[in-house]
Interface confidence: low
């Protein structure tokens, strides 16, 4: 039968030929009568056989990682007979491993993200190298991992390639780390081959920083003319964290005056100081408020970083604005009796400069010929007033600062002219009456009424009478109707046109004023030649003729 041992050939042998082993038939007595033959893939090219001895040689450098075993067939022939001595048989040549492959990291590039401040031992990532050498052959493919760069923050488990945190890291100091891992085969023993890989480890942010004001004191100014809601300035805190962890809210911590407010601009993370109530320089020219800032989102477990909110002091200076004069009242109403003499006192208006410099005030009246005002605000008349011409005056009084004539204020002043009984009652219209020559006694000639230009305090009451002369010798009489009218009646029968064509009657009208005023009003009565029906048309004609200068017979 065949005699052979297990065949091994080391890979990567540089010698021209390497003796692998010997194939032999136990029938071979060494007299060179047997011929050995090698068949199969690799026979003659990779392996050759000494036909006489059966010695096998490798004539090529082998690479186990390319091919780890060769299956060949062996024949042995008796050269004297040409017949096979043994049946053809299959045998195996194994390529034995040498450590000719370094470990390789196949999943590069490695990148990992881990939260900053993670505790020691936190798993970051596992890196794995592979070694093409034979894992079953000694330690050629047994790897050990070590850290070349990344201390003291990271460590690597030697056998697994698991990278862990070995020291807490602060993203705000450094946000990414390049860790270099070395894998060595032969479990690190002499002759080991190594490969390295880089791992980019990025720290994700946690909210471990509270916002802190950039300044301990901010100085802002606000004009006293600023309306409520005005933004008077911004304050800013900085937070070393990023993203949502850096979002902050500003608020007022202290403002006794409750004059200001702070709103947060979430785009810029600034605090905007807002005027909540109007300020007045003359009342208070500076304010001090305290503001605080906190993160918008804080996890419960990170509260230890946010115990004391950062605060800042804000000094707000009120800027003085030259304000126009301020009248004591929004308007004034004065009264003055009519007919008072020119220069009479009407009233006093008063305006002051609200600013600290207290400029003297000059007063003026817009377009008035009736009133005057002096620098003390005293209004007087320049003419005597007649209520019956104007009972009210609507004046515009202007106050101007002496030191800044552009600072002007105006207010309305109403002057009421009070009535005095300075007008006697008089006929309400012109009366011209007619009496017929044949008129009888007691005939009504005319009803008269009166008017009084004075204002009635209660109600006008007029008293009608004939003058003393007319009462004694009058052809007419008067009856007061007690309703501010009176009737004129004939006091005799018959009148003569030729002898007395016209009567002029003096009628006294008195009012009920204090003192009472009386006027004398003349009533003209024409005597007419009337027809039987009492028509005075002839009279009218005659009168017309008379008035035109014609005489009628």
């Amino acid at each position: 039968g065949w005699v052979w041992n297990q065949f091994f050939v080391p890979e990567e042998m540089n010698t021209t030929s390497h003796h692998v082993g010997r194939l032999r038939s136990d029938l071979d007595n060494g007299n060179n009568s047997f011929q050995y033959k090698l068949l199969g893939a690799g026979a003659g090219s990779t392996f050759i056989i000494d036909e006489r001895t059966g010695d096998i040689y490798a004539i090529e450098k082998l690479d186990r990682e390319e091919r780890s075993l060769y299956i060949l067939r062996a024949q042995v022939i008796d050269i004297t007979t040409g017949r096979a001595v043994e049946p053809e048989s299959e045998f195996v040549i194994k390529v034995s491993d040498i450590n000719d492959n370094e470990p390789k990291f196949l999943d590069e590039p490695y990148e990992a993200i881990v939260p900053e401040m993670s505790p020691e031992g936190t798993l970051v990532i596992q890196v794995t190298a592979s070694d093409a050498d034979d894992p079953s052959s000694g330690n050629n493919a047994r790897l050990l991992y070590s850290l070349l760069q990344g201390q003291p923050y990271f460590s690597v488990e030697p056998t697994t390639g698991v990278i862990r945190i070995s020291s807490k890291m602060d993203r705000e100091l450094q946000d990414e780390y390049w860790v270099i891992i070395q894998a060595k085969d032969m479990i690190g023993q002499p002759g080991a081959l190594s490969g390295t890989t880089s791992v980019l480890i990025k720290l994700s942010d946690v909210n471990d920083n509270k916002p802190i004001f950039k300044e301990s004191l901010y100085r802002l100014t606000v004009s006293e003319s600023a309306p409520t809601g005005t933004s008077i300035g911004t304050i800013m805190a900085y937070d070393n964290d990023i993203g949502e962890n850096a979002e902050m809210d500003y608020s007022i911590e202290e403002d006794d005056s409750q004059t200001f407010d702070i709103i947060t601009n979430h785009e810029t993370q600034e605090g905007i100081v807002i005027l909540k109530k109007k300020v007045n320089f003359e009342h208070q020219n500076h304010y001090g408020i305290r503001a605080k800032v906190k993160n918008h989102h804080v996890d419960e477990q990170l509260m230890k970083y946010h115990t004391e909110a950062s605060t800042t002091f804000i000094k707000i200076q009120v800027e003085d604005v030259d304000e126009p004069p301020l009248f004591l009242l929004p308007y004034y109403i004065f009264e003055i009796f009519e007919e008072t003499p020119q220069g009479s006192f009407v009233g006093v208006v008063s305006a002051t400069d609200p600013d600290n410099r207290k400029s003297p005030i000059r007063y003026s009246i817009t377009r008035s010929k009736v009133f005057n005002i002096d620098d003390n605000g005293t209004i007087t008349t320049t003419n005597s007033l007649d209520r019956e011409i104007s009972a009210w005056y609507n004046l515009s009084i202007t106050a101007t600062e002496k030191y800044n004539i552009e600072q002007i204020s105006s207010i309305p002043v109403y002057v009421q002219v009070l009535n005095i009984n300075d007008h006697a009652p008089e006929f309400s219209q012109y009366y011209e009456s007619y009496v017929c020559e044949n008129a009888g006694s007691g005939q009504v000639i005319q009803t008269i009424s009166a008017v009084d230009r004075d204002e009635s305090i209660e109600e006008h009451h007029f008293y009608f009478n004939l003058s003393v002369e007319d009462t004694n010798s009058s052809s007419f009489t008067i009856i007061d109707n007690q309703d501010n009218t009176a009737v004129i009646l004939t006091n005799r029968t018959g009148f003569n046109l030729q002898e007395e064509p016209i009567f002029y009657i003096s009628i006294l009208i008195a009012d009920n004023g204090i003192p009472s005023l009386t006027s004398t009003n003349t009533l003209t009565i024409h005597v007419c030649d009337c027809d039987d029906s009492g028509s005075t048309q002839t009279c009218q004609y005659q009168e017309l003729m008379l008035s035109m200068g014609f005489k009628t017979e």
């Epitope: 070590s146 850290l147 201390q151 003291p152 450094q174 390049w178 270099i180 390295t196 880089s198």
Partner: antibody, heavy 116, light 112 residues
Framework: QVQLQESGPGLVKPSETLSLTCTVS????????WSWIRQPPGKGLEWIGY???????NYNPSLKSRVTISLDTSKNQFSLKLSSVTAADTAVYYC??????????WGQGTLVTVSS | QSVLTQPPSVSGAPGQRVTISCTGS?????????VHWYQQLPGTAPKLLIH???NRPSGVPDRFSGSKSGTSASLAITGLQAEDEADYYC???????????FGGGTRLTVLG
């Protein structure tokens, strides 16, 4: 404040071994990497190698065959040995602490002259 | 020959602005490793000036600033002062060498 102080002979004969020690004060040697760096007269800086507090080392490939760096945590010291020295090894030798990827604390340096 | 390339020298008058460049390759700065800058005053040990490309340690004036782009970085010094006269080194990590590397250094001379 961490301070580093190099010590060792200022003169070494050619072919002998240069030995230096760096004493760390103001902080523990356990936690960081510690490096040796040298500077030949009038020339630039050259990193020699480092030792991690766990004891693992890494050396400049150009000096690897001659360099040994060791650690004595009990004394808070680490040492450099450079064998088979020649005149080209004459330099100021600095010890330094590695912080991440840079050297944040340095010793003041010690001049070692290689001469017979 | 240094792995990171710096100009040997730069100069400027007091008050002026100067920049120092540091050029690397795809195995160091280009891979994403940070660049750090050191100032070495005559006869003293190097002192960390900028770390992580642009961060100033406390005590370093804001006249010093750093930036990084692609495979290079630069250090800018504004308002130059006489006490800024020193050697400046850039430093990074090189993955192909598995170690830290320095630039050759740049001597800054303040004129006048």
């Amino acid at each position: 404040q961490v301070q580093l102080q190099e010590s060792g002979p200022g003169l070494v004969k050619p072919s002998e071994t240069l030995s230096l020690t760096c004493t760390v004060s103001g902080g523990s040697i356990s936690s960081y990497s510690w490096s040796w760096i040298r500077q030949p007269p009038g020339k630039g800086l050259e990193w020699i190698g480092y030792i991690y507090y766990s004891g693992s080392t890494n050396y400049n490939p150009s000096l690897k065959s001659r360099v040994t760096i060791s650690l004595d945590t009990s004394k808070n010291q680490f040492s450099l040995k450079l064998s088979s020295v020649t005149a080209a090894d004459t330099a100021v030798y600095y010890c330094a602490r590695n912080w991440a990827f840079h050297f944040d604390y340095w010793g003041q340096g010690t001049l070692v002259t290689v001469s017979s | 020959q240094s792995v990171l390339t710096q100009p040997p020298s730069v100069s400027g008058a007091p008050g002026q602005r100067v920049t120092i460049s540091c050029t690397g390759s795809s195995s160091n700065i280009g891979t994403g490793y940070d660049v750090h800058w050191y100032q070495q005053l005559p006869g003293t040990a190097p002192k960390l000036l900028i770390h992580g490309n642009s961060n100033r340690p406390s005590g370093v004036p804001d006249r010093f600033s750093g930036s990084k782009s692609g495979t290079s970085a630069s250090l800018a010094i504004t308002g130059l002062q006489a006490e800024d006269e020193a050697d400046y080194y850039c430093q990074s990590y090189d993955s192909s060498l598995s170690g830290w590397v320095f630039g050759g250094g740049t001597r800054l001379t303040v004129l006048g």
